[in-house]
Interface confidence: low
C-alpha cells in the first residue's frame, strides 16, 4: 500500500540546492551610459509538494512551496554618467547586491539591509 | 567573467521533476468514522531563480518561481458514517483527487474539474 500522508518523506536521494551564482549585471538608465557590475543571482531547485484537500477540511492544508531567493541582500548606489543630459549629468541607481541565497517559503519578502 | 544575466541559463544537467505519488489519505470528520482512500500527492523540485533588482527599474524583474502542484484534479464525494449522531447519521466530504502534477508558476490556482 502507498504511504500515508505523514510518511511522504522528501526522498534522501534528492537534495534541494540553492546557490548564489556570480553574474555580470548591466545597470542602465535612458540617456545614460550603462555600467557593468559584478553581482550574484540566486538559482536552484527547492522542494515543493501539494497534498489533496478535503472540504470541509479535516486537517491543515498540506501545501508546501520553497523557492530559491536572496537570504541576505543590500542596496548599493551605482552612479551613471548621462552626457546627453546637461540638466541631469548623472543618475543614481539603487542596485540590489545579493549576499547569499537559500530555499525559503514562496512569496516571502526578501531580507534587505541598508546601503 | 561570469555570464551576464540574460545568459544565466537553467543548465540541462539539472532537470526539474514533479511527480504524482500514490498515497493513502485518511478522510475524517468529528464524531464520524474515518475512511482510508487511495489518492495522489504532488512532490518535486522545480526551478526558481531571482536576479537582483535595480531602482528605478531598468528592466523587468527577473524573478521566477515554479512549484510542484496539481495540473489536473477533480472533486469526489466520500461519505462518512457518523454512528453517534442520530440527527446527522452520515456526512459527505469533498475530496480533491489529484490526477497529475506539473511544475507551475508559484501562486497559480490549481485546475479543478467538476465532480
Amino acid at each position: 500500500a502507498p504511504p500515508p500522508i505523514n510518511k511522504l518523506a522528501l526522498f534522501p536521494d534528492k537534495s534541494a540546492w540553492c546557490e548564489a551564482k556570480n553574474i555580470t549585471q548591466i545597470v542602465g538608465h535612458s540617456g545614460c551610459e550603462a555600467k557593468s557590475i559584478q553581482n550574484r543571482a540566486c538559482l536552484g531547485q527547492c522542494f515543493s509538494y501539494s497534498v489533496p484537500n478535503t472540504f470541509p477540511q479535516s486537517t491543515e492544508s498540506l501545501v508546501h512551496c520553497d523557492s530559491c531567493m536572496p537570504a541576505q541582500s543590500m542596496w548599493e548606489i551605482v552612479t551613471l554618467e548621462c552626457p546627453g543630459h546637461e540638466e541631469v549629468p548623472r543618475v543614481d541607481k539603487l542596485v540590489e547586491k545579493i549576499v547569499h541565497c537559500s530555499c525559503q517559503a514562496c512569496g516571502k519578502e526578501p531580507s534587505h539591509e541598508g546601503l | 567573467a561570469p555570464p551576464p544575466i540574460n545568459k544565466l541559463a537553467l543548465f540541462p544537467d539539472k532537470s526539474a521533476w514533479c511527480e504524482a505519488k500514490n498515497i493513502t489519505q485518511i478522510v475524517g470528520h468529528s464524531g464520524c468514522e474515518a475512511k482510508s482512500i487511495q489518492n495522489r500527492a504532488c512532490l518535486g523540485q522545480c526551478f526558481s531563480y531571482s536576479v537582483p533588482n535595480t531602482f528605478p527599474q531598468s528592466t523587468e524583474s527577473l524573478v521566477h518561481c515554479d512549484s510542484c502542484m496539481p495540473a489536473q484534479s477533480m472533486w469526489e464525494i466520500v461519505t462518512l458514517e457518523c454512528p453517534g449522531h442520530e440527527e446527522v447519521p452520515r456526512v459527505d466530504k469533498l475530496v480533491e483527487k489529484i490526477v497529475h502534477c506539473s511544475c507551475q508558476a508559484c501562486g497559480k490556482e490549481p485546475s479543478h474539474e467538476g465532480l
Epitope: 546557490e19 556570480n22 | 541559463a9 540541462p12
Partner: antibody, heavy 118, light 112 residues
Framework: QVQLVQSGAEVKKPGESLKISCKGS????????IGWVRQMPGKGLEWMGI????????RYSPSFQGQVTISADKSISTAYLQWSSLKASDTAMYYC???????????WGQGTMVTVSS | DVVMTQSPLSLPVTPGEPASISCRSS???????????LDWYLQKPGQSPQLLIY???NRASGVPDRFSGSGSGTDFTLKISRVEAEDVGVYYC?????????FGPGTKLEIK
C-alpha cells in the same frame, strides 16, 4: 585569480591504482561544475564526467562509467579522478575544467599526464 | 550519443584573411529554454583548451571580437574575421545538451 591547478605527471604500471587532483581557487568552488576531459596522445578531446561539488551530483559518460571514479572534497576545493586498476590504454593527458552545467568550460587546469607502462 | 562533425579538418589561412569552420550535430542542440547548447574551444599547441564561444553565439570573457559563433539546431559556424598568427591550433565544437557531451574531431588551423 580564478584558476584550477592539477597534480603532477604520473608514471604507473598496469594494475596499479591512481588518484589525480584538481584544486580550484579564486571562485566559489561549490557553485560550478568540474568536468574531466581525456586527450590521448595525438588525439581529440573526450568528455569523461562531471561533478557538482555543492551536492556531489556526478554524471559519467557511458564510456567511462565503472572505469573511473570522480569525487570532490568541497572543504578543500578539490576534485579528484581515480582509477582502481590502470591499463596501458589509460595513457593520456587528463584535464579538469570548470563548467556552467555541462556547458561553457571556461577555466581549465594545466593537465596531468598519466603514463601507464610495464 | 550525439555525433559531432566538423569541416574542414585542416584549414590553411593567410594572416589577415577570414576563416570559417562548420560544425554539425546528429540532433538538434536547441533547448526549450531557447539556448543552443554548443561551445567552441581552441587548443593552441602545447596548451590546455580554452573556451571561445558558449551557448552557440556568446563570446567568452577575454576572447577577441574577431571571433563569432552563429547557427541554431544542428548547423553551427565559427568565424574569425581576420586571422592572426596567434590563432593557430585545433578548434573543437562540443555539444552539451545530451549527456555525455561530445566533441567534434577538431579543425587544425595553420598559417600559410
Amino acid at each position: 585569480q580564478v584558476q584550477l591547478v592539477q597534480s603532477g605527471a604520473e608514471v604507473k604500471k598496469p594494475g596499479e591504482s591512481l588518484k589525480i587532483s584538481c584544486k580550484g581557487s579564486g571562485y566559489s568552488f561549490t557553485s560550478y561544475w568540474i568536468g574531466w576531459v581525456r586527450q590521448m596522445p595525438g588525439k581529440g578531446l573526450e568528455w569523461m564526467g562531471i561533478i557538482y561539488p555543492g551536492d556531489s551530483d556526478t554524471r559519467y559518460s557511458p564510456s567511462f562509467q565503472g572505469q573511473v571514479t570522480i569525487s570532490a572534497d568541497k572543504s578543500i576545493s578539490t576534485a579528484y579522478l581515480q582509477w582502481s586498476s590502470l591499463k596501458a590504454s589509460d595513457t593520456a593527458m587528463y584535464y579538469c575544467a570548470r563548467g556552467h552545467g555541462a556547458t561553457a568550460f571556461d577555466i581549465w587546469g594545466q593537465g596531468t599526464m598519466v603514463t601507464v607502462s610495464s | 550519443d550525439v555525433v559531432m562533425t566538423q569541416s574542414p579538418l585542416s584549414l590553411p589561412v593567410t594572416p589577415g584573411e577570414p576563416a570559417s569552420i562548420s560544425c554539425r550535430s546528429s540532433q538538434s542542440l536547441l533547448h526549450s529554454n531557447g539556448y543552443n547548447y554548443l561551445d567552441w574551444y581552441l587548443q593552441k599547441p602545447g596548451q590546455s583548451p580554452q573556451l571561445l564561444i558558449y551557448l552557440g553565439s556568446n563570446r567568452a570573457s577575454g576572447v577577441p571580437d574577431r571571433f563569432s559563433g552563429s547557427g541554431s539546431g544542428t548547423d553551427f559556424t565559427l568565424k574569425i574575421s581576420r586571422v592572426e598568427a596567434e590563432d593557430v591550433g585545433v578548434y573543437y565544437c562540443m555539444q552539451a545538451l545530451q549527456t555525455p557531451p561530445t566533441f567534434g574531431p577538431g579543425t587544425k588551423l595553420e598559417i600559410k
